[in-house]
């Protein structure tokens, strides 16, 4: 069964910078990746970025840079302009559209007691939406 993993990390040097890493574990070709925060895409979440393997990326504040790391994983850098670090308690979700498997989505957040630079373990919380 395909899986999606999500890692959220705070940058050690800049406490206002966060990076979301997401990956797809499974066969098939990735057609699209959607990253959202506050919940799954289309279920209360707000879209942060959309990545297509060839057509490019779209991103919306506070997303700073969305990019492909491998053919099946992406990263999204976020700039937290607020002083109170709202990202620390936020859920980030990544949805991978793969053919013919369908859409697979998982969510993750920064561990409550994480030190700067510490990553959340890559344990997916799959929201299985095989469209």
């Amino acid at each position: 069964t395909p899986e999606v993993w999500v890692q959220v990390q705070m940058e050690a040097t800049e406490l206002s910078s966060f990076t979301v890493h997401c990956g797809f574990l499974g066969p098939g070709s990735i057609s699209l990746v959607t990253v959202s925060w506050g919940g799954p895409d289309g279920a209360g979440g707000t879209k942060l970025a959309v990545l297509h393997p060839e057509l490019g990326t779209r991103q919306w504040a506070p997303a700073r840079q969305a990019r492909w790391e491998t053919q099946s994983s992406i990263s999204l850098a976020l700039e937290d302009s607020g002083a109170s670090s709202p990202f620390a308690n936020t859920t980030f979700c990544c949805k991978f559209a793969s053919f013919p498997e369908g859409s697979w989505e998982s969510c993750g957040s920064l561990p409550p007691s994480s030190d700067p630079g510490l990553s959340a373990p890559p344990t997916p919380v799959p929201i299985l939406r095989a469209d």
Epitope: S31, R58, F99
Partner: antibody, heavy 122, light 107 residues
Framework: QVQLVQSGAEVKKPGASVKVSCKAS????????ISWVRQAPGQGLEWVGW????????KYSQELQGRVTMTTDTSTSTAYMELRSLRSEDTAVYYC???????????????WGQGTLVTVSS | EIVLTQSPATLSLSPGERATLSCRAS??????LAWYQQKPGQAPRLLIY???NRATGIPARFSGSGSGTDFTLTISSLEPEDFAVYYC?????????FGGGTKVEIK
């Protein structure tokens, strides 16, 4: 190279239906969508509709909604556009073009098929 | 529906001259606008997407600019093969719409 090859010209009577095919090659068919655009003789370009080759979701122009149906066959990397209840004003060259797998983003058209002339005449 | 108005309808220029084509949207489309070139008897060809990004294989003499409602396609020095009809298309709102076209003809 990326290529879209369309079926040949059609002559139809008013009230009939036409189904135009568009065979894609040179890319991963399911990572994109297909849009259809028509051009009446001597006129500009008119968007007809879009289908995602990934999940078969569709969007149609309001003018043609109810008369047009777009489908894909992922096993043959072919897209189809069927237009029903043809009228003389549907006479046009119909183009397919590669676009985005989602309607909201990246929906520019590149490349285009060679076009299929559909003539509606009694 | 977003209406795209292209001007001028016809542009008469000589090879080597600079061509400036305008596309105005009835409401903001951000930077989500594309430009196409069409020659007689041929399918359109993508030139520019997202207002200013040149498509693969398009010569550097073609450039696009603008955001919101006002966009420009510039051909810095016209080559004989550039005489054609040019269309803009907005990618921002449903339904996707095209401008009426600008014909660039030899003076």
């Amino acid at each position: 190279q990326v290529q879209l090859v369309q079926s040949g010209a059609e002559v139809k009577k008013p009230g009939a239906s036409v189904k135009v095919s568009c065979k894609a090659s040179g890319y991963t068919f399911t990572s994109y969508g297909i849009s259809w655009v028509r051009q009446a003789p001597g006129q500009g370009l008119e968007w007809v509709g879009w289908i995602s080759s990934y999940d078969a979701s569709t969007k149609y122009s309001q003018e043609l909604q109810g008369r047009v149906t777009m489908t894909t066959d992922t096993s043959t990397s072919t897209a189809y556009m069927e237009l029903r209840s043809l009228r003389s004003e549907d006479t046009a060259v119909y183009y397919c073009a590669r676009g985005s797998p989602i309607y909201e983003h990246f929906n520019w058209f590149d490349p285009w098929g060679q076009g299929t002339l559909v003539t509606v005449s009694s | 529906e977003i209406v795209l108005t292209q001007s001028p309808a016809t542009l008469s220029l000589s090879p080597g001259e600079r061509a400036t084509l305008s596309c105005r949207a009835s409401q903001s489309v951000s930077s989500y606008l594309a430009w196409y070139q069409q020659k007689p008897g041929q399918a359109p060809r993508l030139l520019i997407y997202d207002s200013s990004n040149r498509a693969t294989g398009i010569p550097a003499r073609f450039s696009g600019s603008g955001s919101g409602t006002d966009f420009t396609l510039t051909i810095s020095s016209l080559e004989p093969e550039d005489f054609a009809v040019y269309y803009c298309q907005q990618l921002s709102h449903h339904p996707l719409t095209f401008g009426g076209g600008t014909k660039v003809e030899i003076k």
